[in-house]
Interface confidence: low
Amino acid sequence: TERLCHPCPWEWTFFQGNCYFMSNSQRNWHDSITACKEVGAQLVVIKSAEEQNFLQLQSSRSNRFTWMGLSDLNQEGTWQWVDGSPLLPSFKQYWNRGEPNNVGEEDCAEFSGNGWNDDKCNLAKFWICKKSAASCSRDEEQFLSPAPATPNPPPAGSGGGLNDIFEAQKIEWHEHHHHHH
């Protein structure tokens, strides 16, 4: 049978060498980090203007408030991505007008409308996971024929101590996949 290259797991979206998962349920910011961790990904860290435009469009199209991997939890007023990199000055243009305002301990960043907003980290919102796309030069599980594969299983024992909370989430993702067949 013909073998097709699928650089991303089923239900993930490919863009410029990376795979993105737009959640269909909501979690607080910390738990969103862990949800991404459970599937070998990271709460989205934006590296380019093109990536920002792509993600903002995904979020605004669905009219959802969506967590990204950006916060000033480490030091008030100093925004940092979850991979440890600082928020570059060139990215500050993406804040909505008057944001970040830190009203009432708003330490985590979300996609909101056509830009970014800071909000309370304990609020439940949608989230976006990001991981590198699979190379199509190797015979990996993303090579599919004829039907798409299920999402990559999470690494054994991972989850930053929240495995129990996210068992249900992982089941939901798998069920969501199967319902589309």
Epitope: G40, S71, L73, G157, S158, G159, G160
Partner: antibody
């Protein structure tokens, strides 16, 4: 800067419930996980569990049926309840901020409160 | 549960000399995101523990640069380049990869 202060009775009778509260000052309770750790005299540290919201908790399975943690955001406090205590639960109890999967580590810690289980 | 094993359990050191503490886990603490979920704490006599190193090798705020953490997977090391008198206490490692988070037994550092 964030500071934590444990409070609660220092003496609890066997089979009763141990109740401790940790008050957070200098910062909001709503952005982090909060954890409880205990240490019997002269022994090592044991992780009891952590709470983010009252609906989002993780407990040590060794204590799971006996422990409950909750958060009161209006008072900037979180609490620990341990049911059916025995002498083995006698320990110094610490509360700490768990910086979560992104930052990592427990920091800061409270100064600890000694709980003795005895009749 | 993940079991954490520290060695040595007692460590007499001369001031100014280096010191090294080992921590081993029963399964890998390296996640696919590149982080090692291993932290180090120091509990000075009569005090609460204090965070020294988080995520394997990151020094916590205010921790002197004579402290360093290294290692990956199952084998980790805390090093003190030049021990000072104020470094005495019990050092603990902890895995934070999965609940229940588990501590090592502790290593007591004392001055010779």
């Amino acid at each position: 800067q964030v500071q934590l202060q444990e409070s609660g009775p220092g003496l609890v009778k066997p089979s009763e419930t141990l109740s401790l509260t940790c008050t957070v000052s200098g910062g909001s309770i709503s952005s982090y996980y909060w954890t409880w750790i205990r240490q019997p005299a002269g022994k090592g540290l044991e992780w009891i569990g952590r709470v983010f919201t009252s609906e989002s908790t993780n407990y040590n399975p060794s204590l799971k049926n006996r422990v409950t943690m909750s958060v009161d955001t209006s008072k900037n406090q979180f609490s620990l309840r341990l049911n059916s205590v025995t002498a083995a639960d006698t320990a110094m109890y610490y509360c700490a901020r768990d910086r979560g999967t992104y930052l990592g580590g427990f920091d800061p810690w409270g100064q600890g409160t000694l709980v003795t289980v005895s009749s | 549960d993940i079991v954490m094993t520290q060695s040595p359990l007692s460590l007499p050191v001369t001031p100014g000399e280096p010191a090294s503490i080992s921590c081993r886990s029963s399964q890998s603490l390296l996640h696919s995101n590149g982080y090692n979920y291993l932290d180090w704490y120091l509990q000075k006599p009569g005090q609460s523990p204090q965070l020294l190193i988080y995520l394997g090798s990151n020094r916590a705020s205010g921790v002197p640069d004579r402290f360093s953490g290294s290692g990956s997977g199952t084998d980790f090391t805390l090093k003190i380049s030049r021990v000072e008198a104020e470094d005495v206490g019990v050092y603990y490692c902890i895995q934070a990869l999965q609940t229940p988070f588990t501590f090592g037994q502790g290593t007591k550092l004392e001055i010779k």
